[in-house]
Structures are given as C-alpha cells and as structure tokens.
Interface confidence: low
C-alpha cells in the first residue's frame, strides 16, 4: 500500500457472488502499473448481504434494492471517492438462479433486471448481471486458486505448498460445493477429454491448459438434502420420516409444497397423502452414506469412466483445492487438517451424527439451528460426493487440500470471473494480448 | 490489529533440540504463509523455510533441510520451528514473520519480536 | 541460490543529507525485492516491497527503484531516526536470501 500522504496509484473491482443460499459482495484491489503481472490482485473486503439469494425474491422484487443496500455502502466507504466511476461492478449468479430460469426465463429475467437497475444506481462502473454457466462457475474457481497460488508464473512461489524438489507448476484441481451445484476442475494427465462439454482450453502466461470441468446441477448441499428427501418420503409408510442424517432427538416439520418446488426433487415427486411430514432424526451415518448415495446413478456410463449420472471423469490428477462448502462444512466439523485421514473422517462422522441433538445444541449454543441441524447430512453428503462420486480414496484423500484463503484471498470463482473480465490475464508471458471473454467459455 | 507473538528465550545443550512458537493473535492466520528468519549476533538475516498454516506443507532453505522442521495449529493460530542437533554456531535470535504480499510481490509485512536461543555446553 | 549483495556495508550521511543504498542480486529477481530498517534489539521493519512500492505508514523520503539486478533504495532527507541498519531481500527464489546489509551511520 501507498504512503497515505501521496495518492495510491491502484484500481479496485467488485463481484457480487449471487448464490443459491446467499449473495456475498467481493472488493478487490491491484497496482495500476502491474496489471498484467501474475498474482498482484488481491481481496480487501468480504460482505455477506442479509438475507437468502435472489432467487427467493421471485415474488417482492421490490425489495431487492434494500437487500443490497448494506453491502453497496460497504464498498462505498471502502473504495476511496476518486476511484469510484472508474470501478467495474460485476454480479454473477449461479445454480438458484439456473434452477429459476429452468422453471421460468421471464421470473428469471425479471429478478437480474431489478438487481440491474438497483445496482446502477450506484457510483460504480456497473458491468451488467448475468447468470454464470456452470462450466464457467468451474472453470473461474480453477483460475482463482491457480492464480492465488502463482502456478501461472514461470518464478517459483516461495509459500508453495508443494516442496520444491517437485514440479512447482503443475495446477490444482478445484472442488467447489454450493447450496445447488457442485463443479469439478482438473487437467487430467495425458488423458483425452471424451466429452467436449467437459473440455476447456485455456492459453495463459504463455502456457496451454487442457482442463476438465463439470457442474453438477442439483448436487449443491442444500438441494442434496431436498433430493434426498424427496426420495425417501416416497417409501415412508406415513408423515414421519425417520431420517439417518439429522441427529438423534432431532424433530422438523417439512411442507410436502416446499418439497416439490424445486426442479431438483422432479423426478421424485409423486402424489403424497398428506400436506406436512415430520423429519425425525436417527443419526446413523452408515445409513445417512447409503440414502445419499443413493442420488448417485453409477450403472450408466457411455465413456471410458463417469463420476455419475452419465457424466464423463477422467481419471483424478494431482492436489485439489476444496472450497466454499467443502471449506465451511469442514472447519466446522474440525476435520480441515491436513493430518486427518479419510478414515478418521468417517469415524469423527460416524460420532457427531451419533450425538443427541440436545447435546448438540449445548455444545454449540451460538449456531442458527437451522444450519447446525444440517451439519450431518453436509459433512456425510461431501464424502460420499469425493469418495463415490468423484472417486477419491483413502490414498488420495491427502491430495485434497480444504481451503478458505489463500493469502487473504477467498477461493472461488468471483476472482477469477474479475481478473477475465478486467483482462487481467495476458495470454502470453510476459505481457501481450489478454485473453478475450470467449477464449475459454 | 495483528500481533505475532512469541516464546521466551531458551538455553540450550549442543546436540539438543528447541523449538520456537509464534502466535497470531487478532487477525487471521490460516490464509498467509508464515516464515522464519534468524539472525546470529552481530549478523545479518538469514531466511529458514516457510509455512501457509492452510495447507501445513512448508518449505526449507537447502542449509537446514533435515535439521528443522516447521509446522503450524489452526485452531490456535500458531507456527512453530523447531530445529535439532543444535551447535553453537545456531546461537541467535529467530523471527517468525508474516508474508503479506499480494501473490506476485511478498514481503514481510509483520514480524514477532524474536526469540533469542543460547546454545552453550 | 541468489546471493544479494548491499553496498556500501557502511554509510556515514549528516542528517538532512540524501543516503543511496545500493543491492545487488546475483541473477534476475524481477521487481520481487524488498527492503527492510533494522534498528538495534529490534525486529526488522518493511520499508519498500515490489521494489519501489512503499508500505503503509512509510514516510515519503523513503523511496525504492530498480529492477532485474541493480536495485537502489533513496533517503531524501535523513532524520535522526533513520540511523540503523538496512536489508534488501530477494524474494523470487528458494530460498529467499538477504543482503548483507548496509549500516547507515551518523557523520
């Protein structure tokens, strides 16, 4: 940072992160004169709006300009005054909104025109909204924790997590968890990409990447969990669901309306004799593992090898960064550690889904409970996400790394969505044309 | 405001081990790498190896590969340093510092104050 | 390994004089240099990071240049707390090295 007696000679940029459960508005920083250098971006500022996605104002649009007024002052006071006109504001949004616009494109459109027209209201460089595809929600993750940990400079990262006797180069994959999709990023090893829906290439700091990617629409945690439900009232005998994933003691009422009003829990709805059921937690991991797998269509498979339901994986290929969910399910179960095997992940699970819920809500009196009642079914639904969806062992549990930051940066797509749009990734090394929008998506 | 603070000072016997511990207090920890730096007296610094506590993989300069080992505690927001079969040529002050930079410029933007380590027959 | 060499190892300046601390890096270090105050009991302080870029609450009079090899750190005008040692530091490469440091003392 400048002395504050002289000017700061930077420039600033916004993302808001238009999530299924949540929006998060992003204020990142750079040196004006080093723009086209590798890694000078980095994030000043995280403000979580109030309140639940855009997707949830289908029906009080009006109200979406309160939504995002704290955060818009927040980058108000944050960006000094002068830089203001020249700040791009980027929103993008991600599975809610795909899932409202598979239900209606003109309830979708409406909700993104009045966050348009909310945002321009500020003294920003406003950029647009848009609904991100999920192979770009993928893709942008990959070039976030690949850009934050230098893999795309020639020099040596000192902080690199790999020794340095061994490739320093070699990217990692990326593991993103929403609440409604989950994406996959990795370059295979030497491996065709057999399904070019899955492919990317990517030309950066002079260096070709062939990289694999894929979203999986409705395998976000939250709508895991509604798949799931819908699955298993389907065989219940009557209103109770006796469920595995929700502790012991655990009771909840479920609308059989709300059930059914995402496009996720289609395919399993059915005609039901009564309006409510009563969610009544077991807390059984084994048995929490065998219903979610359950989501999972493994006996289809059209290529050489598919994660599920038909889609194409090539074989897993180096360290992954694991983040948004990933990260926040598992700090909060305490199993982030690199020093924590698979199998000790799945004894520490097996032990805290087996915890009275009263016991569970003493021993963490500050959690909303709606967020801590789901804290089985999430820390159950990532394993059997990475173990039999991805096809991560106990061997190469170790090469997953679950991240928050990297050096005071949040890890997910909104950088990388930024540093493209801004063009603040040459395709050359050292400085040469930046990569256009449609280089790689 | 961020802090890193340190142990006391040791004493110790050639051929002995010490290890050093450095605690973020006030601010986050995880997301930046840590290093070491340690400076014998009436010397310059010297870099030893470094950390992200995130990732728990560090990095060792060539002279002390094998000697030292770093680590560091999340949940304490803590990096240690430990370095055995010391001598008396090992006899300085180690600095734990924080590398704030920006990815393509680090720097050590926030350092402990030292701890001084004796080591005498 | 990158061997960084400081000149002068010493410095006399009056106060209010311009100091000129020189660096130099063995190979190619980019603008990945930073320079650091030493003062005696103390820890080291950043001064300049990026090689010319200062650190928040630097006073202006410090200023940092150069680029590659040849690096050069300025004291406008010195100030009777600006006696102490200085360090430059490469950090480019494994592992990262310092210079020998450069006293800068009163005349």
């Known amino acids: 940072t400048q002395n504050k007696a002289l000017p700061e000679n930077v420039k600033y940029g916004i993302v808001l992160d238009a999530g299924s459960s949540h929006t998060s508005l992003y204020i990142y920083k750079w040196p004006a004169e080093k723009e086209n250098d590798t890694g000078v971006v980095h994030q000043v500022e995280e403000c979580r709006v109030k309140g639940p996605g855009i997707s949830k104002f289908v029906q009080k649009v009006n109200e979406i300009g309160i939504y995002l007024t704290d955060c818009m002052e927040r980058a108000r006071e944050v960006i000094p005054r002068s830089q203001h006109q020249e700040t791009p504001v980027y929103l993008g949004a991600t599975a809610g909104m795909r899932l409202l616009r598979m239900e209606s494109e003109e309830l979708a459109d409406r909700v993104l025109d009045v966050v348009e027209r909310s945002l321009s209201n500020y003294p920003f460089d406003f950029q647009g909204a848009r609904i991100i595809t999920g192979q770009e929600e993928g893709a942008y993750g990959w070039i976030t924790i690949n850009y934050l940990l230098g893999k795309f400079s020639q020099k040596t990262r000192w902080f690199s997590i790999v020794p340095y006797e061994t490739n320093n180069q070699e990217t990692f994959g990326a593991l993103d968890l929403g609440g409604a999709s989950t994406q996959v990023t990795f370059v295979p090893q030497n491996q065709t990409i057999e399904s070019p829906d899955n492919a990317l290439q990517f030309r950066l700091y002079g260096k070709d990447y062939n990289v694999y990617t894929h979203s999986f629409l409705c395998y976000g945690k939250d709508q895991a969990l509604w798949q799931k439900l819908a699955k298993d009232i389907q065989v219940a005998s009557n209103e109770i669901l006796r469920d595995p994933c929700f502790h012991p003691g655990y009771k909840k009422v479920v609308n059989v309306s709300d059930l059914y009003k995402t496009p996720c829990t289609k395919r399993f709805e059915m005609t039901l004799p009564f309006q409510q059921f009563e969610i009544q937690g077991i807390g059984n991991y084994q048995q929490c593992h065998q219903s979610i797998l359950e989501l999972f269509n493994t006996s289809y498979c059209p290529y050489s090898q598919c994660a599920f339901n038909g889609i194409f994986l090539p074989p897993l290929q180096g360290d992954f960064g694991a983040f948004s969910a990933f990260y926040f399910v598992m700090k909060f179960l305490n199993l982030t550690s690199e020093k924590v095997s698979q199998e000790k992940v799945t004894e520490m699970m097996k032990k805290f889904c087996a915890q009275p819920w009263e016991e569970i809500k003493t021993s963490y009196a500050g959690v909303k409970e709606k967020y801590l009642s789901e804290y089985c079914f999430s820390g159950t639904y990532i394993l059997s996400l990475l173990l039999q969806g991805y096809h991560f062992t106990a061997d190469s549990w170790e090469h997953i790394h679950f991240i928050g930051k990297i050096q005071g940066s949040d890890a997910g797509w909104t950088l990388g969505y930024m540093l493209n749009l801004t063009n603040m990734i040459p395709a050359e090394q050292p400085l040469s044309t930046p990569l256009s929008h449609s280089t790689y998506v | 405001q961020v802090q890193l603070v340190q142990s006391g000072a040791e004493v110790k016997k050639p051929g002995s081990s010490v290890k050093v511990s450095c605690k973020a207090s006030?601010?986050?920890?995880?997301?930046?790498?840590i290093g070491w730096v340690r400076q014998a007296p009436g010397q310059g610094l010297e870099w030893m190896g470094g950390?992200?506590?995130?990732?728990?993989?560090?990095n060792y300069a060539q002279k002390f590969q094998g000697r030292v080992t770093i680590t560091a505690d999340e949940s304490t927001s803590t990096a240690y340093m430990e370095l055995s079969s010391l001598r008396s040529e090992d006899t300085a002050v180690y600095y734990c510092?924080?590398?704030?930079?920006?990815?393509?410029?680090?720097?050590?933007?926030?350092w402990g104050r030292g701890t001084l380590v004796t080591v005498s027959s | 390994e990158i061997v960084m060499t400081q000149s002068p190892a010493t410095l006399s300046v009056s106060p209010g004089e311009r100091a000129t601390l020189s660096c130099r890096a063995s190979?190619?270090?980019?603008?990945?240099l930073a320079w650091y105050q030493q003062k005696p009991g103390q820890a080291p302080r950043l001064l300049i990071y990026g090689a010319s870029t200062r650190a928040t609450g630097i006073p202006a009079r410090f200023s940092g240049s150069g680029s590659g090899t040849e690096f050069t750190l300025t004291i406008s005008s010195l100030q009777s707390e600006d006696f102490a040692v200085y360090y430059c530091?490469?950090?480019?490469?494994?592992?990262?090295?310092f210079g020998g440091g450069t006293k800068v003392e009163i005349k």
């Open positions: 530091q490469q950090l480019t490469k494994w592992p990262l090295t």
């Open positions: 006030g601010g986050a920890f995880s997301s930046y790498a």
């Open positions: 510092a924080r590398d704030g930079g920006g990815y393509q410029h680090h720097y050590f933007d926030l």
């Open positions: 950390i992200i506590p995130t990732f728990g993989t560090a």
């Open positions: 190979q190619s270090v980019g603008s990945n």
